[in-house]
Interface confidence: medium
């Protein structure tokens, strides 16, 4: 057997909606032939299922084998280093991978202008891997919220934040003209999930968008 291989120092999930990626840190002084074995345990079925015998990357997409995450008690994963006939001890994720660990995202943000207001529509994520009945709004069916950050260009400061409880929102620009850039971060008030800011969407507001009312 020779010298024993060290175990991967840490193993963790990084997940978005139906995009569940397992990551691990490499063993020190790994060789060109070192690879990693991945196994998965579903809570309620107390046996480890081998997923990959020899991954040479430091991550593995487990979405396809965790599609029931949102209807299950969650998973644990474990990884060990393999080099020829030698292998290390397993390193297990130190927390249960459940729906609570999924980082919330939005699909996109669409902006349009109407009478001096910026009207926004948040498109929810529609991942290809998701089963047809497992939509974002069916899984997170209540208390969806969004933080809206608005930035006026030029200028690198965010001049306002507001929280909205719907996928449609409106922003009053107080008669200002110029380019306005908007970002959105989702949350669910009843849950502890983290949210990721969307990419910035910008729209130009000129005088022509204002109508005069008495």
């Amino acid at each position: 057997h020779g010298t024993e291989l060290p175990s991967p120092p840490s193993v963790w999930f990084e997940a978005e909606f139906f995009h569940h990626i397992l990551h691990w840190t490499p063993i020190p002084n790994q060789s060109e032939s070192t690879c990693y074995e991945v196994a998965l345990l579903r809570y309620g079925i107390e046996s480890w299922n081998s997923i990959s015998n020899c991954s040479q990357t430091l991550s593995y997409d487990l979405t396809a084998v965790t599609l029931d995450l949102y209807h299950s008690n969650g998973y644990r994963a474990r990884v060990r280093a393999v080099d020829g006939s030698r292998h290390s001890n397993w390193t297990v994720t130190n927390t249960r991978f459940s729906v609570d660990e999924v980082t919330l995202t939005v699909g996109s943000v669409n902006l349009e202008i109407h009478n001096g207001f910026i009207l926004g529509k948040i498109q929810l994520p529609r991942p290809k891997m998701a089963p047809a009945n497992d939509t974002y709004e069916s899984i997170f069916s209540h208390f969806r919220e969004y933080e809206i950050a608005i930035r006026k260009v030029p200028g690198n400061f965010t001049f306002t934040h507001k929280k909205v409880k719907h996928e449609n929102f409106s922003l009053l620009t107080s008669g200002e003209v110029g380019e306005f850039c908007v970002q959105v971060k989702p949350s669910v008030a009843s849950r502890s999930n983290k949210g990721m800011w969307s990419k910035e969407e910008c729209i130009s507001l000129t005088r022509q968008y204002f109508t005069v009312t008495n």
Partner: nanobody, 126 residues
Amino acid sequence: QVQLQESGGGSVQAGGSLRLSCGASRYTYSSYCMGWFRQAPGKEREGVAVIDSDGSTSYADSVKGRFTISKDNGKNTLYLQMNSLKPEDTAMYYCAADLGHYRPPCGVLYLGMDYWGKGTQVTVSS
């Protein structure tokens, strides 16, 4: 999960100084907005000072010129140096962080910090 732990609070006379620290564990992000927020009894939580990963800082008007925020990246520690303290600075002080991609520019108006410490009490008596 990133964990934040504040320290350095206490009681001080008006005009005195305190230095708050916030240790961040399991912290590997190169892009962040970190800051100090406070909440006095019966009041809303408010932003005090924030720092972006590029080093830019932002302060609430009420503390400008008196408080300084800084971060030691090597130690993964956030600081708030508070000078010329006033009784109205009395509050529970929280360290908070928003991490990851696409963040808007850091600001004391930030509502959606993802990670919060448990807080450290600062009491300023006249």
